[in-house]
């Protein structure tokens, strides 16, 4: 565990062991301040050559419990003539991102690290020709 | 919370206090299976009219402790004959994902949730022209 | 404290469109999805869908959709309602309210004063 | 669309008197939520989860249920508790609320 620092205030504590059950305080910490709002515009899903949907993703029992998903609009990319080209396709950025999933008919509440895939937003790529042999 | 089950089970526990002191076991479960690899082709930052290179964010105190992040190549897009066109801008995707970051000096080792924006890839959107007044 | 500042009642006419606003204050606006609630004497509360800030997504109830469009301006913190081609059914008062993201568990939990929408010719 | 009803639609009670309403819902969810509202302002969340009561909220209410059926109880009515209780569930779009409870001191 990368996690556990180099200095390690805690030499008795054995990684594998602190792995399994550590202490988490859930309230958000918010590092990024005022820099979200002006360095994140939400209009790219509409104006760029490969638009997407977001769709809500609601799980009670996972921390965040909400989850703006991605989908691409269409299967190809939008022209500067506002028409679907056919030579490019749109596509999906997915990011593996770490979710806390409470664990069934825990007491106290305990929860479990989880990888999730989600899509962030499309971008335009050039159709791939597949040769005859 | 949410993750606090229908029944309860836990009834004397606030929820307010419940959010600051939570147990996590940090063993990735993969919920994703072999799917991640299949799903994810990792050459589109190479394909996209917009692309983008990866860069390594390395902390030691957060859990990951390795985090990829997305830079785009070009401050335009890259057209068909692979030259850069000056009417289509290359915008990072980024997407706030949460992190757990080890309170200093914490034993035994505790952590704080922590949003952080992260550069997932590119996309390409028509430049905005400022009308002159 | 936590305030959702509605903008004023409007009397408009049949067929216009309005726009409301609800300004946010005393948390960050992008930690909350903005969703907002119509009620009637005739209908009670009907949720008419979602806004998250943070990402731009928009979510409706089927009922409304076509009807309301919802943004959101992080930069002011100020969420928006567009109503359109309005009936008198569209007559009502019309709420803002917040949703946490991270733990939906709370619900919505703070609200705005309502807003007062009269559709009449 | 799952449909919340409420009973009684007009009740009253008296000062030191147990008040219980209840919630049906046509489809199971998974938790209930309480608004509070008096005439001419907004609702205010009352009991969440089913079981919290938001801040503020004196504890002679509680909520309870599972499954379909559902209460909000005051264990000794009070003349501030006089108002229309609306209940709400989120566990399937559309969100819907319930026709509301109003509740009278006699």
């Known amino acids: 565990a990368a996690i556990i620092p180099q200095s390690s205030a805690c030499p008795n504590t054995e990684a594998k062991d602190f792995l399994q059950n550590v202490k988490v305080n859930l309230k958000v910490f918010n590092s990024l301040g005022a820099k979200v709002s002006s360095r994140r515009p939400s209009d790219y899903l509409n104006r760029s050559t490969s638009p997407w949907t977001l769709h809500r993703n609601e799980d009670p029992d996972r921390y965040p419990s909400v989850i703006w998903e991605a989908q691409c609009r269409h299967q190809r990319c939008v022209n500067a003539e506002g028409k679907l080209d056919h030579h490019m396709n749109s596509v999906l950025i997915q990011q593996e991102i770490l979710v806390l999933k409470r664990e069934p008919e825990s007491c106290p509440f305990t929860f479990r690290v989880e990888k999730m895939l989600v899509g962030v937003g499309c971008t335009c790529v050039a159709s791939i020709v597949r040769q005859a042999a | 919370a949410a993750i606090i089950p229908q029944s309860s089970a836990c009834p004397n526990t606030e929820a307010k206090d419940f959010l600051q002191n939570v147990k996590v076991n940090l063993k990735v479960f993969n919920s994703l299976g072999a799917k991640v690899s299949s799903r994810r082709p990792s050459d589109y930052l190479n394909r996209s009219t917009s692309p983008w290179t990866l860069h390594r964010n390395e902390d030691p105190d957060r859990y990951p402790s390795v985090i990829w992040e997305a830079q785009c190549r070009h401050q335009r897009c890259v057209n068909a004959e692979g030259k850069l066109d000056h009417h289509m801008n290359s915008v990072l995707i980024q997407q706030e994902i949460l992190v757990l970051k080890r309170e200093p000096e914490s034993c035994p080792f505790t952590f704080r949730v922590e949003k952080m924006l992260v550069g997932v890839g590119c996309t390409c959107v028509a430049s905005i022209v400022r009308q002159a007044a | 404290q936590v305030q959702l500042q509605q903008s004023g009642a409007e009397l408009v006419r049949p067929g216009t469109s309005v726009t409301l606003s609800c300004k946010a204050s005393?948390?960050?606006?992008?930690?909350?999805?903005i969703h907002w609630v119509k009620q009637t004497p005739v209908h009670g509360l009907e949720w008419i869908g979602v806004n998250d800030p943070e990402s731009g997504g928009t979510f409706y109830n089927q009922k409304f959709d076509g009807k309301a469009e919802l943004t959101a301006d992080k930069s002011s913190s100020t969420a928006y309602m567009e109503l359109r081609s309005l009936t008198s059914e569209d007559s009502g008062v019309y709420y803002c309210?917040?949703?946490?993201?991270?733990?939906?568990?709370?619900?919505?939990?703070?609200w705005g004063q309502g807003t007062s929408i009269t559709v009449s010719s | 669309q799952i449909v919340l009803t409420q009973s009684p639609a007009i009740m009253s009670a008296s000062p030191g008197e147990k008040v219980t309403m209840t919630c049906s819902a046509s489809?199971?969810?998974?938790?209930i939520y309480w608004f509070q509202q008096k005439p001419g302002t907004s609702p205010k969340r009352w009991i969440y989860?089913?079981?919290e009561l938001a801040s503020g909220v004196p504890a002679r209410f509680s909520g309870s249920g599972s499954g379909t059926s559902y209460s909000l109880t005051i264990s000794s009515m009070e003349a501030e508790d006089a108002a229309t209780y609306y209940c709400?569930?989120?566990?399937?779009?559309?969100?819907?609320f319930g026709g509301g409870s109003k509740l009278e001191i006699k």
């Open positions: 489809s199971s969810i998974s938790y």
């Open positions: 989860a089913t079981f």
């Open positions: 005393g948390y960050i606006f992008t930690d909350y999805e």
């Open positions: 309210t917040r949703y946490y993201r991270y733990e939906s568990f709370y619900g919505m939990d703070y």
């Open positions: 709400h569930q989120r566990s399937s779009y559309p969100w819907t």
